[in-house]
Amino acid sequence: FPQDRPFEDTCHGNPSHYYDKAVRRCCYRCPMGLFPTQQCPQRPTDCRKQCEPDYYLDEADRCTACVTCSRDDLVEKTPCAWNSSRVCECRPGMFCSTSAVNSCARCFFHSVCPAGMIVKFPGTAQKNTVCEPASPGVSPACASPENCKEPSSGTIPQAKPTPVSPATSSASTMPVRGGTRLAQEAASKLTRAPDSPSSVGRPSSDPGLSPTQPCPEGSGDCRKQCEPDYYLDEAGRCTACVSCSRDDLVEKTPCAWNSSRTCECRPGMICATSATNSCARCVPYPICAAETVTKPQDMAEKDTTFEAPPLGTQPDCNPTPENGEAPASTSPTQSLLVDSQASKTLPIPTSAPVALSSTGK
């Protein structure tokens, strides 16, 4: 590399720097115990402490415990990363009534719209179901959902939501309008109000009735009803919701009358090959940084130069590609960006390169 010599020479004799031929730059060598936050660190601030598993480095440079989503009514929204906490949200079918930092202190079941009311906005993890009065006198042969309802005026009533106390978050019997919590859950499923951001702000309602049946008195919604585990697609066809039954998948949003169930890789895994509303192949998170330094001569006793943290403790792996590296494709679920297809130990396919930030954040 004769053309690089002048640059390389500027690094020599300075133990705090090294020359990286791949990026043709002098880089700052992070001191022992600190780890680089980019491929070619330029200054001490590009080196950070590595926290223990399930801890993250906060803005004050302190190792802080990631919140836990272990309560029955919570699910993990984003994993614990080296520089950000895990984020929890209420599980599908519930919304947050009392928020907490990176989590929710109190989740309630989505309201079930009472008789004579229909769902105006489905419940989400953050908001309860919004109901509106059903428009009377609508023809049973509705050409489209829009023709099935008229704009309503006045207040928008909401059924009283059902709280789930963290202390009693198992399926115990809690009275809900003469029923139990299980009855409430069953009713929630009947309204099929999805916990799907895609349906927020879109008028929707109960699944409706088959067009062969007359509209019941007072019903403002006569759309085609699909079989259970099917949804009405944009072309008006009943389409099967994807299944999240594979061991490596979890349900992200439920099957709703107008949108498919969506699946994502379970915590600790990342999507290598995306699929519509799901992931075709999940792989364990790569170890993005290591924990304990061991000398090369210790390699005989230890299997690695470094003792690495368990899988999933360093999940947000967004690399800066090296020369000639092709990052992997992104996916709707958490996606891993790597240089190229990994070996059998971590098989991750690739596609066209993607521009990435160099900070790893």
Partner: nanobody, 123 residues
């Protein structure tokens, strides 16, 4: 003084195989990542493969996928690159590099480099 010394290069016919070795000596402090780069005559440096020694995860450039295999022998402090089904375009000087995995990423720093070993694929 850290040293990475490559060996195993040479002349091989197309379709043939070679195994490159990279012996690490000295104290490569904090290193948890080793890899191979190559530079063909008149071309720039090209990343070939990498192994994260903490997780054992291995990565390959598209151009070598399915033909090259990276591995390590901890007891010998040695990194290997098994090259099969060699092609004329694999002709290059192959360099071994060692560094650290970047926090929150799957790329590595390249803090230490070997002097390289020449691989020539020709009939």
């Amino acid at each position: 003084e850290v040293q990475l010394v490559e060996s195993g290069g040479g002349l091989v016919q197309p379709g043939g195989s070679l195994r490159l070795s990279c012996a690490a000596s000295g104290y490569i402090y904090s290193s948890n990542c080793m890899g191979w780069f190559r530079q063909a005559p008149g071309k720039g440096l090209e990343w070939v493969s990498r192994i994260h020694t903490g997780s054992g995860s291995t990565y390959y450039a598209d151009s070598v996928k399915g033909r090259f295999t990276i591995s390590r022998d901890n007891s010998k402090n040695t990194l290997y690159l098994q090259m099969n089904s060699l092609r004329a375009e694999d002709t290059a000087v192959y360099y071994c590099a060692a560094g650290r995995v970047v926090l929150g990423a799957v790329v590595c720093t390249n803090e230490y480099w070997g002097q390289g070993t020449l691989v020539t694929v020709s009939s």
